[in-house]
């Protein structure tokens, strides 16, 4: 038997992936565990093997179909179970009725690129990945710019309260190396959270022209 507190948290990427993390205080030595998903009314079910990410937590991804296929809807309820092998049988360690569109975490934005760069300005665009058509335009973004001599944690957050897949960064220093990241969040869902940050995009502002103020 396993004692201690257990936490089972899952997020839906809005298309065909449910990512889960299971934390268990009591030690589980060399035990095989998995997450099993049973949606109401749908014929399919899916399983993934929990793999350790730290001493007391395990994670796995339920791949429900092709990356851009819409496998679940706003009315779906999925029974998620953590099952661990005990001898010849499986024991239910955690269970939840999972409402996918109340627990959203999208994929990080992709395809970041510099559209136009000047001495003090830079226009950057990106794309969202594997996001449901259900959202229409109901998304928001956060962006941050890494300046020389600072950390990402120190970077001020720029909030875009609409589905706007570009930004114009102002008041930059000429001939300076920067990095830029963006993340996305649907407006829908009680337990919805921000996507991971995108891969950083490195760019350099243009040098100031001699004798001119650009």
């Amino acid at each position: 038997a396993v004692n201690g507190t257990s936490q089972f948290t899952c997020f839906y990427n809005s298309r065909a992936n449910i990512s889960c993390v299971w934390s268990q205080d009591g030690a589980l030595q060399d035990t095989s565990c998995q997450v099993h998903a049973w949606p109401d009314r749908r014929r399919w079910n899916q399983t993934c093997e929990l793999l350790p990410v730290s001493q007391a937590s395990w994670a796995c991804n339920l791949i429900l179909g092709a990356p851009d296929s819409q496998k679940l809807t706003t009315v779906d309820i999925v029974t998620l179970r953590v099952l661990c092998r005990e001898g010849v049988r499986w024991r239910v360690m955690a269970i939840q009725d999972f409402k996918p569109f109340e627990n959203l975490r999208l994929m990080a934005p992709i395809s970041l690129q510099v559209v136009h760069v000047e001495t003090h300005r830079c226009n950057i665009s990106w794309e969202i990945s594997q996001a449901s058509h259900y959202f229409e335009r109901h998304l928001e973004f956060e962006a941050r710019t890494l300046s020389p001599g600072h950390t990402w944690e120190e970077a001020p957050l720029l909030t875009l309260k609409q589905k706007q897949e570009w930004i114009c960064l102002e008041t930059l220093t000429p001939d300076t190396q920067y990095e830029f990241q963006v993340r996305v969040k649907p407006l829908q869902g009680e337990f919805t959270t921000w996507s991971p940050w995108s891969q950083p995009l490195a760019f350099r502002t243009k040098p100031a022209a001699l004798g001119k103020d650009t």
Partner: antibody, heavy 118, light 111 residues
Amino acid sequence: QVQLQQWGAGLLKPSETLSLTCAVYGGSFSGYYWSWIRQPPGKGLEWIGEINHSGSTNYNPSLKSRVTISVDTSKNQFSLELSSVTAADTAVYYCARADRRFGELRYWGQGTLVTVSS
Amino acid sequence: NFMLTQPHSVSESPGKTVTISCTGSSGSIASSYVQWYQQRPGSAPTTVIYADNQRPSGVPDRFSGSVDSSSNSASLTISGLKTEDEADYYCQSFDSSLYMIFGGGTKLTVL
């Protein structure tokens, strides 16, 4: 033994609101979907919508703008409201319990004939 | 829109076997489970088959169900027909948005 008993007004005028209630006796109220289905005279079955014990609803798109299904878990009851009725809404209305896993309607109310006439 | 199409009526003699089809219009009928209901005049429907091929207790084994994903259809087969089997039969499933869908119904006449 699970039983569903339904009641509500049987005669309405056009533009009025249809209101029906279904009481569930025996069995668990949570863990199921609670549905409304109708059947016009001499015709087939039409799903109106459903609600689960936590209050999440799903409605037939063709009726969605006029339908409200609500639940009172303390009384083991759920209700249907259909606004702006016309003669085309004349039908026998059934409440039913739908299984979570498969969506089977195992238990049905006795049915209420609702007639819309001026 | 996903629709389930059934023959309007079928008829057969007592003791014979009859099959009622239920064909999906688009998408896959195999993405959700299929139920079959029997409805006699003046009564609420009752389940004869659920989850494609399962019989509730009390339903005779003369009733069987199947789903064929290649033809995007489900079938209800009644063998050893009896006069008491005369009724309307409805298939039921879900579309991809989990809207419950009924077939138009099939009137079974036992000659």
